[in-house]
Amino acid sequence: KIDACKRGDVTVKPSHVILLGSTVNITCSLKPRQGCFHYSRRNKLILYKFDRRINFHHGHSLNSQVTGLPLGTTLFVCKLACINSDEIQICGAEIFVGVAPEQPQNLSCIQKGEQGTVACTWERGRDTHLYTEYTLQLSGPKNLTWQKQCKDIYCDYLDFGINLTPESPESNFTAKVTAVNSLGSSSSLPSTFTFLDIVRPLPPWDIRIKFQKASVSRCTLYWRDEGLVLLNRLRYRPSNSRLWNMVNVTKAKGRHDLLDLKPFTEYEFQISSKLHLYKGSWSDWSESLRAQTPEEEPTGMLDVWYMKRHIDYSRQQISLFWKNLSVSEARGKILHYQVTLQELTGGKAMTQNITGHTSWTTVIPRTGNWAVAVSAANSKGSSLPTRINIMNLCEAGLLAPRQVSANSEGMDNILVTWQPPRKDPSAVQEYVVEWRELHPGGDTQVPLNWLRSRPYNVSALISENIKSYICYEIRVYALSGDQGGCSSILGNSKHKAPLSGPHINAITEEKGSILISWNSIPVQEQMGCLLHYRIYWKERDSNSQPQLCEIPYRVSQNSHPINSLQPRVTYVLWMTALTAAGESSHGNEREFCLQGKAN
């Protein structure tokens, strides 16, 4: 009932708690002398369901049969309406609609750890929408019985607060849960188990790893477990991997040797425990141990390449380049690279340690046979040296690859293709494709990139360090023993018309013709590989079409003669540059008048 109900009563039959689909009778009755001031025909009793009027009656009592109530709680309130006055609340009642509990299913019990307490869970089934009490009963040997009740509306878990001990691990215990509400009761099927069935060990703790003699091949994992643990599962993985390696061990007694770890790798380790081969359940995984394995000496060999540059009649510059070893080859932090340069006939050798760079430049005499060896060193040792005999890589013309082409292949890729050299193609031991940004000054500081290709390949896709709208000088080398031949080409992955034209910096007269000199277009404005320059000229103040001369682009060229100008005529001259995508805007305009004699 709600409020004090001083003026009347609301009665509910058969009960305030009903089964879904049942009919309920609600009666609202006024107490004596609690009606309207005038005679009772003017009493209007109104029954509300929440905020809606659902029935009314003129008189001292109202009877209403209510059907179709939804699951849950419905509030009914009875009010009295008299002429010319507000409604007066008489009384009210809540009706609870629900269902009898279903049989609890999947009752299962667990004790976490040997010192833990027994707790059980079950599935309640559909919601009863009513206050439902759950009673969990556990019976064991010697007629021992424990019972626990739960009055939570959503109860599906109870902890007995008792600890099963391993004195008689095969003794049987039986658990049962019973649900009771106003509409009925139901019990689960009994669940029978032993100590070994339900004790779930605590996860292992205090996990450590030791590497004997700082070697990855002598690695032992240690941990602590509860006393009765028989089985362990170990799982481990490199920290950057999603896949676990799994190992099952029996009677490990808190230690296990791991034989397949990679050096210089951070691993994550976890361990789980179980009391019995086929009974009970695994513990949760332990907290992760993260540890880095020790270094081992590098494996593999460095990929080394070089460039030669003529300095003068007696000296040449050698630039060596090498690629970092992969993580799996380096097997540790590379501390330095050891470069040894040796003159093969005289036996002179010099060794240098390089840190922080993957290149080295030196000047050597042009005479003699020179070889280099490069290796990588970490704290445990060095990789096998890569040995290279320094030769003229482009000296053997017959070894030069033919018909080299470079074509854009999607975003920031260039496909380089070639034909084998004319000289016996089977003599080729490997091809090397080299590329670097084209700089008109032939700047040797520009990074060099290369890749090696098997002798039967006639194409290579280059993608490393390739930028859009940049022109690359690409060389393909064919190597055979101590000989090499090469061919080169310019290529870009993406191009558009240059942003500006060349800047004419001088026009000079020479024997009746003129020589035009210009400054190169800045690299960042070339927008790809230049194919041609165009020189335009026309008579000043003339509306005629300009004449033009097209010159194939060569990196080093920055002047060109023109001999078709008339003497004593003032001309306006300008230049443009072209890529495969189109022509640039005009460069600067210059005026010039040829002083030579007229014909």
Epitope: R52, I54, F56, H57, T67, G68
Partner: nanobody, 125 residues
Framework: QVQLQESGGGLVQPGGSLRLSCKAS????????MSWVRQAPGKGLEWVSA????????DYADSVEGRFTISRDDAKNMLFLQMNSLKAEDTARYYC??????????????????WGQGTQVTVSS
């Protein structure tokens, strides 16, 4: 589902009479108080009359008191409205509804989907 089907409307002269009927289905008719409601052209819903679930108590709007009589036949799931001394201002479409959906207190339009098409009453000379 709840269905209400009104009938009996028509054209009548001022002072004349009509008897409206409502056939109910899809719910336990006898346990529900019922109402008649009307809507004149361009106006809102106006509650007209109600009868309780036993049929022992009735209520009327002041505008129809003494002229209209509400009744029910629970055996046939029927609700009736006898309209006498009709006036031009009684012209409207008449609907029957559960009292909980439309009472002398308020109409809950969210339940209007349960209502029938109504029956048109026109009072005109």
């Amino acid at each position: 589902q709840v269905q209400l089907q009104e009938s009996g409307g028509g054209l009548v002269q001022p002072g004349g009479s009509l008897r409206l009927s409502c056939k109910a289905s899809g719910f336990t008719f006898s346990t529900y108080a019922m109402s008649w409601v009307r809507q004149a052209p361009g106006k809102g819903l106006e509650w007209v009359s109600a009868i309780n679930s036993g049929g022992l108590s009735t209520d009327y709007a002041d505008s129809v008191e003494g002229r209209f009589t509400i009744s029910r036949d629970d055996a046939k799931n029927m609700l009736f409205l006898q309209m006498n001394s009709l006036k031009a201002e009684d012209t409207a479409r008449y609907y029957c509804a559960k009292y909980e959906d439309c009472s002398d207190y308020m109409c809950h339009r969210d339940r209007a989907g349960y209502w029938g098409q109504g029956t048109q009453v026109t009072v005109s000379s």
